[in-house]
Interface confidence: medium
């Protein structure tokens, strides 16, 4: 039960690539508005995003302070006009979210591979550290300072001229592979945590490829 | 297997300088934040500054009782990082440590064996 | 700079007992404090981050609470294993340690 004429958000949903922290809800406000609500399990209820005709919220400040914690979340509905309208219980009507582990569950983003450097018969090839959200001390912390040793990429590399490919894994950002002489190849990256039970992978990162301006070469 | 190894400690006079090293190894230098932490005979641990990693383009920051005096510089071509110390004073006798900075949660996760510096006339 | 005072900075205890120590912010550093243990000849190790969370394979007779500029850490149930420093740690802005505190087992 709740207040005439407001409905109880519904279909809460986390939003989150590389800890950038979005909860969506519906419906799509008919004279009524929504305030969100974010704690850990032991924390205390903290409020974001007041009164608004929005039904999505951006969490990213709240759950960056601790990636490894579980939050919950919970929409208020309100009537347009009478906010201090409560329901029949003596409080705004109101939905929580699923519990959300920013560490366990963010989507890892597409990588970019950085660079590609041959020497010879081998190719270094570098993964951006690509840069999250989350901040400490004025440094915004890069995937690998967030995961750690959890991280690994994988490398898919071919010759131009064929589609058999070949993988590689580090759990750097660097790859040094084999390559023949004289050939080209392309590379595709993609993000890993083994460790993973959901989101485990990344998407593949755009395709590069030798002869194009991305790599540096050095034939010695 | 990480290592840290810090060089260069020994007797200087105060207003003196000295330049303490740490070799680092085991892991992707470039990618990590690197700091230096002191201890005072028979005194707490002091930060004493720290460089940030390849993502954050290498940059630095320093306590207040060091700033101006202290400059902390890498070579990752060397996997090192370098503790400038200039115009030294008593107080700044102490073993010092490198160590490798995780910045998330604020680890030193990995600590070198320390280098002691002892600044007297 | 932000200031830590940390008390106390000694203290003993026997085994079994419950153990608390705290430190004071200079300022509000939200809960950017982290405890670490030192003990002779070893690198110091982080116990708990972020006021609360205890570290990967620490045990949980290790606590921590407080926010803004009071904290505390605990030990709940002390252990011959337990004798050591600690040092309180903000991180909200740089870094600094607090003076530390030398538990001994009476």
């Known amino acids: 039960s709740g207040t005439t004429n407001t409905v109880a958000a519904y279909n809460l949903t986390w939003k989150s690539t590389n800890f950038k922290t979005i909860l969506e809800w519906e419906p799509k406000p008919v004279n009524q508005v929504y305030t969100v609500q974010i704690s850990t399990k032991s924390g205390d209820w903290k409020s974001k995003c007041f009164y608004t005709t929005d039904t999505e919220c951006d969490l990213t400040d709240e759950i960056v302070k601790d990636v490894k914690q579980t939050y919950l979340a919970r929409v208020f509905s309100y009537p347009a006009g009478n906010v201090e309208s409560t329901g029949s219980a003596g409080e705004p009507l109101y939905e929580n979210s699923p519990e959300f582990t920013p560490y366990l569950e963010t989507n890892l983003g597409q990588p970019t591979i950085q660079s590609f450097e041959q020497v010879g018969t081998k190719v270094n090839v570098t993964v951006e550290d690509e840069r999250t959200l989350v901040r400490r001390n004025n440094t915004f912390l890069s995937l690998r300072d967030v995961f750690g040793k959890d991280l690994i990429y994988t490398l898919y590399y071919w010759k131009s001229s064929s589609s058999g490919k070949k993988t590689a894994k580090t759990n750097t950002n660097e790859f040094l592979i084999d390559v023949d002489k004289g050939e080209n190849y392309c590379f595709s990256v993609q993000a890993v945590i083994p460790s993973r039970t959901v989101n485990r992978k990344s998407t593949d990162s755009p395709v590069e490829c030798m002869g194009q301006e991305k790599g540096e070469f050095r034939e010695i | 297997e990480v290592q840290l190894v810090e060089s260069g400690g020994g007797l200087v006079q105060p207003g003196g300088s000295l330049r303490l090293s740490c070799a680092a190894s085991g892991f992707t230098f470039t990618e990590y934040h690197m700091s230096w932490v002191r201890q005072a005979p028979g005194k707490g641990l002091e930060w004493v500054g720290f460089?940030?990693?390849?993502?954050?383009?290498?940059?630095?920051e320093y306590a207040a009782s060091v700033k101006g005096r202290f400059t902390i510089s890498r070579d990752n071509s060397k996997n090192s990082l370098y503790l400038q110390m200039n115009t030294l004073r008593t107080e700044d006798t102490a073993v010092y440590y490198c160590a490798r900075l995780t910045m998330v949660v604020a680890e030193f996760d990995y600590w070198g064996q320390g280098t002691l510096v002892t600044v007297s006339s | 700079d932000i200031q830590m005072t940390q008390s106390p900075s000694s203290l003993s205890a026997s085994v079994g007992d419950r153990v608390t120590i705290t430190c004071q912010a200079s300022q509000d550093i939200n809960k950017y404090l982290n405890w670490y243990q030192h003990k002779p000849g070893k690198g110091p190790k982080l116990l708990i981050y972020?006021?609360?969370t205890l570290q990967t394979g620490v045990p949980s007779r290790f606590s921590g609470s407080g926010s803004g500029t009071d904290f505390t850490f605990t030990v709940s149930n002390l252990q011959p294993e337990d004798i050591a420093t600690y040092y309180c740690l903000q991180y909200d802005n740089l870094l600094t340690f607090g003076q530390g505190t030398k538990l001994e087992i009476k």
């Open positions: 460089i940030r990693n390849r993502a954050n383009a290498y940059t630095t």
């Open positions: 972020y006021t609360s």
